[in-house]
């Protein structure tokens, strides 16, 4: 066990495993989507660059009452080194562009698959 900030935290999950699990969850969301995801909620689009995990969570954290993305939000928190608050915005947000959660998930999935293929796990 590693001691971090007063907690005995679980042993670290290998980044490749964590990324693969996140990809699998996003695939699951896109494949099982029947009604509009999160009732068609809109979120800020983000630049898919370094720091995108926190930015993605900053966007998704403002979606309320959507059980379909709870697991994704949890997984993203594992990639983001700081606690994200609702209403928080990073420089990675495309502030003039809002997209549906479904499209946000698809865009994120495509980019994460690319990162996985290239071996960029962090």
């Amino acid at each position: 066990l590693t001691c971090l900030g007063g907690f005995a935290s679980p042993g670290p999950v290998p980044p490749s495993t964590a990324l693969r699990e996140l990809i699998e969850e996003l695939v699951n969301i896109t494949q099982n989507q029947k009604a509009p995801l999160c009732n068609g909620s809109m979120v800020w689009s983000i630049n898919l660059t370094a720091g995108m995990y926190c930015a993605a969570l900053e966007s998704l954290i403002n979606v309320s009452g959507c059980s379909a993305i709870e697991k994704t939000q949890r997984m993203l928190s594992g990639f983001c080194p700081h606690k994200v608050s609702a209403g928080q915005f990073s420089s990675l947000h495309v502030r003039d562009t809002k997209i549906e959660v479904a499209q946000f998930v698809k865009d994120l999935l495509l980019h994460l698959k690319k990162l996985f293929r290239e071996g960029q796990f962090n």
Epitope: L4, G5, G6, S9, P10, C66, A68, M75, P81
Partner: nanobody, 127 residues
Framework: QLVESGGGVVQPGGSLRLSCAAP????????IAWFRQSPGKEREWVSC????????IYSDSVKGRFTISRDNAKNTLYLQMNSLRAEDTAVYYC??????????????????????WGQGTQVTVSS
């Protein structure tokens, strides 16, 4: 803000069900986590359940033995603990951050912290 109950003394192999209630707010609106702390050790994350109950996660040390659940009508969260071992002896705490999702266990202590805690309930596993 949170109130735990259901602790006690139990023999190895026995069972207990812990409860977590919140008199001042609606537990059903938030993800809730359980932690535990043994004497002389750091507080350890045990389990978490998301608001909908669709995402439940467990530490390796309790997986297959403990079950987290919620009854939103009663505004109560439960931790069913089976096949208890001496090493499960600890004070058990429930916590929330008034978010709908659980925090990834690997993020705990790295800035991802829960802000609302109970006072804890003692669980002792001894023959």
């Amino acid at each position: 803000q949170l109130v735990e109950s259901g602790g006690g003394v139990v023999q190895p192999g026995g069972s207990l069900r812990l409860s977590c209630a919140a008199p001042r707010f609606t537990l059903g609106s938030y993800a809730i986590a359980w932690f535990r702390q043994s004497p002389g050790k750091e507080r350890e994350w045990v389990s978490c359940i998301s608001r909908s109950g669709g995402d439940t996660i467990y530490s390796d040390s309790v997986k297959g033995r403990f079950t987290i659940s919620r009854d939103n009508a009663k505004n109560t969260l439960y931790l069913q603990m089976n096949s208890l071992r001496a090493e499960d002896t600890a004070v058990y705490y429930c916590a929330t951050d008034k978010r709908s999702f659980c925090y990834a266990p690997e993020g705990l202590g790295k800035g991802w912290t829960y802000d609302y805690w109970g006072q804890g309930t003692q669980v002792t596993v001894s023959s």
